[in-house]
């Protein structure tokens, strides 16, 4: 079954990204996203999740890693890593299905 998003009790999360309106946010869960764009160093963003919880289940790749948790400020001290670079024929896709 698809993961049903819920707008039940909200949790307070650390917010650290260019789009944060303050040091914390409120959401259904907390997130950490580590992204490496072509030719750039990986960037780690912390924030809140309300939609598409399936992203939390996606396996890490050499370009992105998603982490989710469900308690107060649980994303504050989390550090993520990316998968080691693999030969092109073995690269995992970002589609988590």
């Amino acid at each position: 079954d698809p993961v049903k998003p819920s707008r039940g009790p909200l949790v307070t999360c650390t917010c650290e990204s260019p789009h944060c309106k303050g040091p914390t946010c409120r959401g259904a869960w907390c997130t950490v996203v580590l992204v490496r764009e072509e030719g750039r160093h990986p960037q780690e963003h912390r924030g809140c999740g309300n939609l598409h919880r399936e992203l939390c289940r996606g396996r890490p790749t050499e370009f992105v890693n998603h982490y989710c948790c469900d308690s107060h400020l649980c994303n504050h001290n989390v550090s993520l890593v990316l998968e080691a670079t693999q030969p092109p024929s073995e690269q995992p896709g970002t589609d988590g299905q």
Partner: antibody
Framework: QVQLQESGPGLVKPSQTLSLTCTVS??????????WNWIRQHPGKGLEWIGY???????YYNPSLKSRVTISVDTSKNQFSLKLSSVTAADTAVYYC??????????WGQGTLVTVSS | EIVLTQSPGTLSLSPGERATLSCRAS???????LAWYQQKPGQAPRLLIY???SRATGIPDRFSGSGSGTDFTLTISRLEPEDFAVYYC?????????FGQGTRLEIK
């Protein structure tokens, strides 16, 4: 005001790859609050979700199209793109891009008709 | 996969009347992520209602949404000439995103 604009060829030959780009203006594609979707509508029919991409590059696709679909994002250009391979006449449709937030698909492109014909 | 079934397929009413459109889900869905859209010929869909009952920006208050679980309703309290269009319900926020097949609201 957020605006989305689809662009790409209006005519594609059978067995080739359909390629469309959605350019977002008035807002950042890199905001973690939003998910960037492609939807299509066959002539005279209903709406069919194709897939979405998050700013991180993570994608999810409609299982019925997954084997032929690739969605990618270019945050530096504030664009995301759709590629649909091995097209047939059954892929003739109006293709829309749309922004998804907790408030639904709140912004849509105007749509672009893609005809598959030799 | 959640299947959304809309009824009736076509609804024929006159301006000033009340329209009631139904959307039934094949399994329970979160009411926070049920939306309704209006589409007119040659135009993109327009968001009317999100989260089952919240009106989108600029949508007149004659449009209202209700429901929970598997049964959802869009009500237009007093039809205006510009309301005659096709209406779609949608489940969003988790995969796969699905749309109903649509209800055509036509002038009687």
């Amino acid at each position: 005001q957020v605006q989305l604009q689809e662009s790409g060829p209006g005519l594609v030959k059978p067995s080739q790859t359909l390629s469309l780009t959605c350019t977002v203006s008035g807002g950042s594609i890199s905001s973690g609050e939003y998910y960037w979707n492609w939807i299509r509508q066959h002539p005279g029919k209903g709406l069919e979700w194709i897939g979405y991409i998050y700013y991180s590059g993570s994608t999810y696709y409609n299982p019925s199209l997954k084997s032929r679909v690739t969605i990618s994002v270019d945050t530096s250009k504030n664009q995301f793109s759709l590629k649909l391979s091995s097209v047939t006449a059954a892929d003739t449709a109006v293709y829309y891009c749309a922004r998804e937030s907790v408030a639904g698909f709140d912004y849509w492109g105007q749509g672009t008709l893609v005809t598959v014909s030799s | 996969e959640i299947v959304l079934t809309q009824s009736p397929g076509t609804l024929s009413l006159s301006p000033g009347e009340r329209a009631t459109l139904s959307c039934r889900a094949s399994q329970s869905v979160s009411s926070s992520y049920l939306a309704w859209y209006q589409q007119k010929p040659g135009q993109a869909p327009r968001l009317l209602i999100y989260g089952t009952s919240s009106r989108a920006t600029g949508i007149p208050d004659r449009f209202s949404g209700s429901g929970s679980g598997t049964d959802f309703t869009l009500t237009i309290s007093r039809l205006e000439p510009e309301d005659f269009a096709v209406y779609y319900c949608q489940v969003y926020g988790s995969i796969p995103i699905t749309f109903g097949q649509g209800t055509r609201l036509e002038i009687k």
